[in-house]
Interface confidence: low
């Protein structure tokens, strides 16, 4: 799978999930998250080789395609597949509230 | 929706389905399929500017994040949204088979 | 596509209530982080921030109307009801509502506002 | 409160000039700063925020800059379409409006 336990170890130049860290005052200009300052959003990138896991048979064959017509700007692209929540703390006025933001961290990719 | 009906009649930049003709024999090397000998799979491609057709919180986040730091690596990827089937003519021998091959066409794209 | 709409009286007599409803849809006022504002603007005058909901109800209001403000969320129905009261002349003004997102600060999409006169 | 304070309230232009147009906030607002440019009869439409961020669809001769208190909307070559009216936003604290600065055809 192409998800952070394999990515983060190795030098992979295809389709994989890199680290991000968002910090969210400087990055987003999110005043209202307290806690808490950042987390790693991490996202996907790196090039979609044929089968590389291919999310359906369109992108099965869209990279067949590519592999076939290299000129061709029609190729499948690397997306998060796999992402997880995460827990923030902000303030309503003075009273602390503590939501769970859903499909926030990126755990890991695949070629769609 | 970022699908046909909308993205084959204007000339839109960003994130969008594009029509794309595929011919078996020719373009991917399947002489197996008897019929049809081609079909439109389409593409998406274009730029995910942020909020455009966001597929979850992390692309909403990860958009605005390419918006305020235009020369970070990291941004949303144009992607198939909603797919249909395919109904193919084959032979095994020279018994003809019909078969529906799923996820094979692009009707729209989301930013992922 | 995201589309707000502003729905009221066009005329209300001084010191009547005024209740605004901003029907929207293409998002929903249930997702972290989502806000719908209000804005007003005075015939060729300026623009004017009156009040604000979030998702999590949490609300904001202009400093110098804000004891005669109300604002609400009916978020199965999406809209948002604000309510002015005590009107006066001074208030005639075309009452815009629209959608703020993440907490950004500012307004992306806008209604196409709505003109209320306040005469006897 | 926050004062927005937009330079000048109008001014005269022809197509192809270069517009720049100011707004100085009462007080340090970091870059909490949003441009609108409206239309006679029309609702506002956000052209830029956090002060330098361009907003998807709007063409590339809108650009925004400045930080704290001083900030600048400047329109590299003026179309016939930009005759309108400009407002600044801060929202920093609350949301303030600028008074708007109007455009003409010289």
């Known amino acids: 799978a192409l998800d952070t336990n394999y990515c983060f170890r190795n030098l992979e130049e295809n389709c994989c999930v890199r680290p991000l860290y968002i910090d969210f005052r400087q990055d987003l200009g999110w005043k209202w998250v307290h806690e808490p300052k950042g987390y790693y959003a991490n996202f996907c990138s790196g090039p979609c080789p044929y089968l590389r896991s291919a999310d359906t048979t369109h992108s099965t064959v869209l990279g067949l395609y590519n592999t076939l017509n290299p000129e061709a700007s029609a190729s499948p692209c690397c997306v998060p597949q796999d992402l997880e929540p995460l827990t923030i703390l902000y303030y309503v006025g003075r009273t602390p509230k503590v939501e769970q933001l859903s499909n926030m961290v990126v755990k890991s990719c695949k070629c769609s | 929706a970022l699908d046909t009906n909308y993205c084959f009649r204007n000339l839109e930049e960003n994130c969008c389905v594009r029509p794309l003709y595929i011919d078996f024999r020719q373009d991917l090397g399947w002489k197996w399929v008897h019929e049809p000998k081609g079909y439109y799979a389409n593409f998406c491609s274009g730029p995910c500017p942020y909020l455009r057709s966001a597929d979850t919180t992390h692309s909403t986040v990860l958009g605005l994040y390419n918006t305020l730091n235009p020369e970070a690596s990291a941004s949303p990827c144009c992607v198939p949204q909603d797919l249909e089937p395919l109904t193919i003519l084959y032979y095994v021998g020279r018994t003809p088979k019909v078969e529906q091959l799923s996820n094979m066409v692009v009707k729209s794209c989301k930013c992922s | 596509q995201v589309t707000l709409r502003e729905s009221g009286p066009a005329l209300v007599k001084p010191t009547q209530t005024l209740t605004l409803t901003c029907t929207f849809s293409?998002?929903?006022?249930?997702?972290?982080?989502?806000?719908v504002g209000w804005i007003r603007q005075p015939p060729g005058k300026a623009l004017e921030w009156l009040a604000h909901i979030y998702w999590n109800d949490d609300k904001s209001y202009s400093t110098s109307l804000k004891t005669r403000l109300t604002i609400s969320k009916d978020t199965s129905k999406n809209q948002v009801v604000l309510t002015m009261t005590n009107m006066d002349p001074v208030d005639t003004a075309t009452y815009y509502c629209?959608?703020?997102?993440?907490?950004?600060?500012?307004?992306?999409?806008w209604g196409q506002g709505t003109l209320v006169t306040v005469s006897s | 409160d926050i004062q927005m304070t937009q330079s000048p309230s109008s001014l005269s232009a022809s197509v192809g000039d270069r517009v720049t147009i100011t707004c100085r906030a009462s007080?340090?607002?970091?870059?909490?700063l949003n441009w609108y440019q409206q239309k006679p009869g029309k609702a506002p439409k956000l052209l830029i925020f956090?002060?330098?961020s361009l907003q998807s669809g709007v063409p590339s001769r809108f650009s925004g800059s400045g930080s704290g208190t001083d900030f600048t909307l400047t329109i590299s070559s003026l179309q016939p379409e930009d005759f309108a009216t400009y407002y600044c936003q801060q929202t920093n604290t609350m949301n303030t409006f600028g008074q708007g600065t109007k455009v003409e055809i010289k």
């Open positions: 007080q340090d607002i970091s870059n909490y």
């Open positions: 629209a959608r703020d997102f993440y907490y950004s600060g500012y307004f992306d999409s």
């Open positions: 293409g998002f929903s006022l249930s997702t972290s982080g989502m806000g």
């Open positions: 956090g002060a330098s």
